[in-house]
């Protein structure tokens, strides 16, 4: 039985050119990540495995940079950036977990970051 | 305290399989992964690849993907690397070492001679 | 797979000495470096991670600095002990690859 929840850093928002931290934190079950996939509406950006460190999808890796911890930071970013995020959590023995997050960029100055929660 | 443990020095025809073992101690063996890492004479070190002691997920280094083979058994805490079809320049020290945190080797084993002469 | 280029190959300091060595991957490891210390006939010892943690146990003249693909290990104040072979290693994405070395000699 799947225990888990997926926090994230929900909706978000950020300013063109700027940079942003996508963040997941999976409580409540005691399975064992062995990976983390960060997905673009259906592109892969990066993989983190347990075993094996992370993996940037070559046309990414000029504005994704791994971390911190599990997370994501792009950086960058273009109004095309704008969508939705997924971070899935390959777990052991429970399965697949899967938080979303809407990452809106703005081209003014007002940009505002959405409530976030600490992640240990 | 925490300590990885290895088999004795081999010595080994071309052709021939080697198996080394490495029994951890001092903490909980499937918490951690177990990598093999070896060093032949006077050259750096050379990464072979990782067993995972939990769900036994194994990947390799693919320069030595086919002749490599990693076990484990979680009954005696004990990893064990297997690498046959030996040549000349499988000649090195072989070692066992634990990626503590992550990726990197904070726990190592004594290391095991294994020489391929014939 | 990730090149790890080590300079120098050998040096020869005197106790007291601050020493320098670096270690530059053939491309973007963000800061996924680690530094270790050999002695003759014995395993690796970690130093340092992440580019600049220190090991649990590791005297505080060693220290690593740098990101991406330029990076640095400094002992500030070299003893008897620290003659030995020093080796990088990144941690970002396997296969791990190490640097060929550098070897610290008694001048």
């Known amino acids: 039985m799947m225990t888990g929840t997926i926090e994230t850093t929900g909706n978000i928002s950020a300013e063109k050119g700027g940079s942003i931290i996508l963040q997941c934190h999976l409580s409540s079950t005691t399975a064992q990540v062995t990976q983390v996939n960060w997905e673009q509406q259906d592109q892969l950006l990066a993989i983190c495995n347990a075993d094996l460190g992370w993996h940037i999808s070559p046309s990414f890796k000029d504005r994704v940079a791994p971390g911190p911890g599990l997370g994501l930071t792009l950086q960058s970013l273009t109004v095309n950036d704008t969508g939705e995020y997924f971070c899935i959590y390959h777990t052991y023995p429970d399965g697949t977990y899967t938080g979303r997050i809407f990452l809106e960029v703005l081209e003014s100055s007002v940009a505002e970051h959405g409530a976030r929660f600490q992640i240990p | 305290q925490l300590q990885l443990v290895q088999s004795g020095a081999e010595v080994k025809k071309p052709g021939a399989s080697v198996k080394v073992s490495c029994k951890a101690s001092g903490y909980s063996f499937t918490d951690y992964n177990m990598n093999w890492v070896r060093q032949a004479p006077g050259q750096s070190l050379e990464w072979i690849g990782v067993?995972?002691?939990?769900?036994?997920?194994?990947s390799y280094n693919q320069k030595f993907k086919g002749r490599v083979t990693m076990t484990r058994d979680q009954s005696t805490s004990t990893a064990y690397m297997e690498l046959n079809s030996l040549r000349s320049e499988d000649t090195a020290v072989y070692y066992c070492?634990?990626?503590?945190?992550?990726?990197?080797?904070?726990?190592w084993g004594q290391g095991t001679l294994v020489t391929v002469s014939s | 797979d990730i090149q790890m280029t080590q300079s120098p190959s050998s040096l020869s300091a005197s106790v007291g000495d601050r020493v320098t060595i670096t270690c530059r991957p053939s491309?973007?490891?963000?800061?996924?470096l680690a530094w270790y210390q050999q002695k003759p006939g014995k395993a690796p010892k970690l130093l340092i991670y992440?580019?600049?943690a220190l090991a649990e146990g590791v005297p505080s003249r060693f220290s690593g600095s740098g990101s991406g693909t330029d990076f640095t290990l400094t002992i500030s104040s070299l003893q008897p002990e620290d003659f030995a072979t020093y080796y990088c290693?990144?941690?970002?994405?396997?296969?791990?690859?190490f640097g060929q070395g550098t070897k610290v000699e008694i001048k």
């Open positions: 067993i995972n002691p939990n769900h036994g997920t194994i």
């Open positions: 992440n580019a600049k």
């Open positions: 290693q990144h941690h970002f994405g396997a296969p791990w690859t």
């Open positions: 070492a634990n990626n503590w945190d992550v990726w990197y080797f904070d726990v």
């Open positions: 491309e973007n490891i963000y800061s996924y």
